[in-house]
Interface confidence: low
């Protein structure tokens, strides 16, 4: 008789999750010489230890501390790119502009990107059927707590000018409930961070509006200013051209506004 299993509202653990985490770790440490010392087996053991045998609605940041310790990584604090609801373009940008980093360019972000995972209380099994949904079930689930933890640490590490890419096609260009709005904004350190510069990415071909005047951007400016951090904002009217000009800055067409 199959044992009764809690049914959650969200999708289950990503297929081949352990192998995927291990493969990503091996690949990352091969390609990033500064992380070659990392023992991927230990990383997986620490990752597993954060959620296996624990109730998937009762995960804490403390559960992830062993993993955080193993994944400690120094990225240039003045080269950090945050993003909200525009992950693909942010990643494409840092793949071209190799000296800038999103969270997913770090080992821990890379390991978990696009994956889902959870366990079950009192069993060593991974739940491949369903995992808690942040809204419908609980916020203290393994995935949400992981991203809250790594996002907080990433923001805390930032210094000088911090950039954030925002999606100008969304109704809320800045969303207080996003990871950026609820975690990263509040963990930038005013004694280290001088300016937050927002890049608002336009979606429409002929969209020439100044989205830096959007009410939600003004709200972001207000939050940042109250934290004694300067704020600046730029419209990226042509994201395709923007990327092209990052690749080939000497191109004559790149002197005009993008």
């Amino acid at each position: 008789v199959p044992r009764w299993r809690q049914q959650w509202s969200g999708p289950g653990t990503t297929k081949r999750f352990p192998e995927t985490v291990l493969a990503r770790c091996v690949k990352y440490t091969e390609i990033h010489p500064e992380m070659r010392h990392v023992d991927c087996q230990s990383v997986w053991d620490a990752f597993k230890g954060a959620f296996i045998s624990k109730h998937p609605c009762n995960i804490t940041e403390e559960d992830y501390q062993p993993l955080m310790k193993l994944g400690t990584q120094t990225v240039p604090c003045n080269k950090i790119l945050l993003w909200s609801r525009i992950k693909d373009l942010a990643h494409q940008f840092t793949q071209v502009q190799r000296d800038m980093f999103t969270l997913e360019d770090t080992l821990l972000g890379y390991l978990a990107d696009d994956l889902t995972w959870c366990g079950e209380f009192n069993t060593s099994k991974i739940n491949y059927q369903s995992c808690p949904d942040w809204r419908k079930d609980c916020s203290n689930n393994p995935v949400s707590v992981f991203w809250k933890t790594v996002s907080r640490r990433f923001a805390e590490a930032a210094c000088d000018v911090v950039h954030v890419m925002l999606n100008g096609s969304r109704s809320k260009i800045f969303d207080k409930n996003s990871t950026f709005g609820s975690v990263e904004v509040h963990n930038l350190q005013p004694e280290k961070v001088q300016t937050l510069e927002a890049w608002v990415i336009h979606g429409g071909r002929e969209d020439s509006r100044d989205l830096c005047q959007d009410p939600t951007i003004k709200e972001l400016e207000s939050i940042i200013s109250k934290r004694n951090i300067q704020f600046s904002c730029k419209n990226i009217y042509r994201p395709d051209k923007f990327l092209q000009c990052v690749k080939n800055p000497e191109d004559s067409s790149c002197t005009s506004e993008i």
Epitope: A23, K27, I31, R98, D105
Partner: nanobody, 121 residues
Framework: QVQLQESGGGLVQAGGSLRLSCAAS????????MGWFRQAPGKEREFVAT????????TYADSVKGRFTISRDSAKNTVYLQMNSLKPEDTAVYYC??????????????WGQGTQVTVSS
């Protein structure tokens, strides 16, 4: 879809050299990294070398450092692996692999069929 075609494998004596080529084709080709992996009989596939497509940054496995050189010809969409001072333990099937533009690949997205390298003592 991206296709990768390796060539240049063969039988060589210990101490000898071989040059492997990997030609990438397919209209979606825009790889961040291309690399070489190898798999010896009864062993797991292991990393050999990788090269960043735009910047040309290279990374090598400790076992081949100083003996193997990875390079690329962007115009030909081709990556090369120059293998010098070959040892019997370098005997394996050598696979070329390419990584997609996004940073979120689990492993390399595209793989060639492999080319056999045999080093006799």
């Amino acid at each position: 879809q991206v296709q990768l075609q390796e060539s240049g494998g063969g039988l060589v004596q210990a101490g000898g050299s071989l040059r492997l080529s990997c030609a990438a084709s397919g209209r979606t080709f825009s790889s961040v990294a291309m690399g070489w992996f190898r798999q010896a009989p009864g062993k797991e596939r292991e990393f050999v070398a990788t090269i960043n497509w735009s910047g040309g940054r290279t990374t090598y496995a400790d076992s081949v450092k100083g003996r193997f050189t990875i390079s690329r010809d962007s115009a030909k969409n081709t990556v090369y692996l120059q293998m010098n001072s070959l040892k019997p333990e370098d005997t394996a099937v050598y696979y070329c692999a390419a990584d997609r533009f996004s940073v979120v690949a689990v492993e390399y997205d595209y793989w060639g069929q492999g080319t056999q390298v045999t080093v006799s003592s």
